[in-house]
Interface confidence: low
């Protein structure tokens, strides 16, 4: 006769492992007992369990509650056992030793492989700011057995680097994604993709990029100089900029306080019916946590009673 088993049995952490051992004997042969042992134990074989043809299943105290026979119906020549709830420490070599009558003893070995699926973690790098050089955007770490594969899925241009740390029964893989921050990356997804034989599908963790920036400021409203004349209603200046985080706006007058009646509404400066008192240099100050910008304009309100023309100067400063 001979033993039928598998070279390798592979299970995922927490699953039940069936350790196969079937004696294919000649007619009239019987299996007296089947002994299962860890064959890679440091101090000789460590018995797991023994299937006795008369006295049934005996389980080592170290495996109490974890070793069972497959559910019925059972073939008396089948010495397979179930190892419940496989853990990493179960990985290794196992030996099945079958004692038969009258043919004697047979033994076979198999290797149990326990896959430990990773639980990946994504850690964003330091705050991204426009103008920085190559900067860490995020790192992704996954630990498993065997070592997982960690890659990145993104439209963003960048560079990746990976490193691996081997532990006694697993390996941790860390991949870093570096980029040169630009405002166009704002809101773009950066996805860490972890592949592993113990996963039914890749695990994906998405991080949304936030890049701090502040655009140059400019002021709109003075495009048609002839509209800025005494008596005109609804005149307004609008400060234009954009940033991340969204900026706040502040209006001042360089050559004195804001005239009475002038309303500040965020990025907009609203004027009452214009008088020559409204002539002056107005400054829009734009700021966020990242930076600040100024833009100033000269308003010259035309008095139709006078012949003098109106001039408008625009100056931007950072």
């Amino acid at each position: 006769g001979e033993l039928e088993t598998s070279d390798v049995v592979t299970v995922v952490l927490g699953q039940d492992a069936k350790l196969p051992c079937f004696y294919r004997g000649d007619s009239g042969e019987q299996v007296g007992q089947v002994a299962w042992a860890r064959a890679d134990a440091g101090e000789g074989a460590q018995e797991l369990a023994l299937l006795h043809s008369k006295y049934g299943l005996h389980v080592s105290p170290a495996y109490e509650g974890r070793v069972e026979q497959p559910p019925p119906p059972r073939n008396p020549l089948d010495g397979s056992v179930l190892l419940r709830n496989a853990v990493q420490a179960d990985e290794g070599e196992y030996e099945c030793r079958v004692s038969t009558f009258p043919a004697g003893s047979f033994q076979a070995r198999l290797r149990l492989r326990v896959l430990v699926p990773p639980l990946p973690s994504l850690n964003p790098g330091p705050a991204l700011e426009e103008g920085q050089g190559l900067t860490l955007a995020a790192s992704c770490t996954a630990e498993g057995s065997p070592a997982p594969s960690v890659t990145w899925d993104t439209e963003v241009k960048g560079t990746t680097s990976s490193r691996s740390f081997k532990h006694s029964r697993s390996a941790a893989v860390t991949s870093e994604f570096h980029l040169v921050p630009s405002r166009s990356m704002n809101g773009q997804p950066l996805t860490c993709v972890v592949s592993h034989p113990g996963l039914l599908q890749d695990q994906r963790i998405t991080h949304i990029l936030h890049v701090s920036f502040l655009a140059e400021a400019s002021v709109r409203g003075l495009e048609d100089q002839n509209l800025w004349h005494v008596g005109r209603e609804g005149a307004m200046l609008k400060c234009l900029s954009e940033g991340q985080p969204p900026p706040s706006y502040n209006w001042t007058r360089l050559d004195g306080p804001l005239p009475s009646g002038v309303r500040v509404d965020g990025d907009t400066l609203g004027f009452p019916p214009l008088t020559t008192e409204h002539s002056g240099i107005y400054v829009c100050h734009v700021s966020n946590e990242f930076s600040s910008r100024d833009s100033q304009v000269t308003v010259d309100v035309l008095d139709p009673q006078e012949d003098s023309g109106k001039q408008v100067d625009l100056v931007s400063a950072s």
Epitope: N123, C140, E143, Q203
Partner: nanobody, 119 residues
């Protein structure tokens, strides 16, 4: 061994909000999962939401769009922001910390915090 302490439960009117917190201490691993379950009187305990160390989330269909789970890895704390609360959200809310152990994965549970939503 892991200890969990929940807080933030209470009585709130329908449509209101509450924020639950759960602080974990003890042997916290680098690959743990944290989350919230709830148990209404006379019903089985059900999953509400879970979150990985990297911020990936999973929600029960009944709370999607209303509840938000978050965590502070540095403080080993998980939060559950509950908005647009409904009377059917009334339950004891239990924090769970899922740790690798010799037998696969082990769940550690908090004592629970009561959330009551009145109509």
């Amino acid at each position: 061994e892991v200890q969990l302490v929940e807080s933030g439960g209470g009585l709130v009117q329908a449509g209101g909000s509450l924020r639950l917190s759960c602080a974990a201490s003890g042997s916290i691993s680098s690959i743990n999962l944290m989350g919230w379950h709830r148990q209404a009187p006379g019903k089985q305990r059900e999953l509400v939401a879970t979150i990985t160390r990297g911020g990936s989330t999973n929600y029960a269909d009944s709370v999607k769009g209303r509840f938000t789970i978050s965590r502070d890895n540095g403080k080993n704390t998980v939060y559950l922001q509950m908005n647009s609360l409904k009377p059917e959200d009334t339950a004891a809310y239990y924090c769970v910390d899922v740790e690798p152990s010799g037998m696969g994965w082990r769940d550690y549970w908090g004592q629970g915090t009561q959330v009551t939503v009145s109509s």
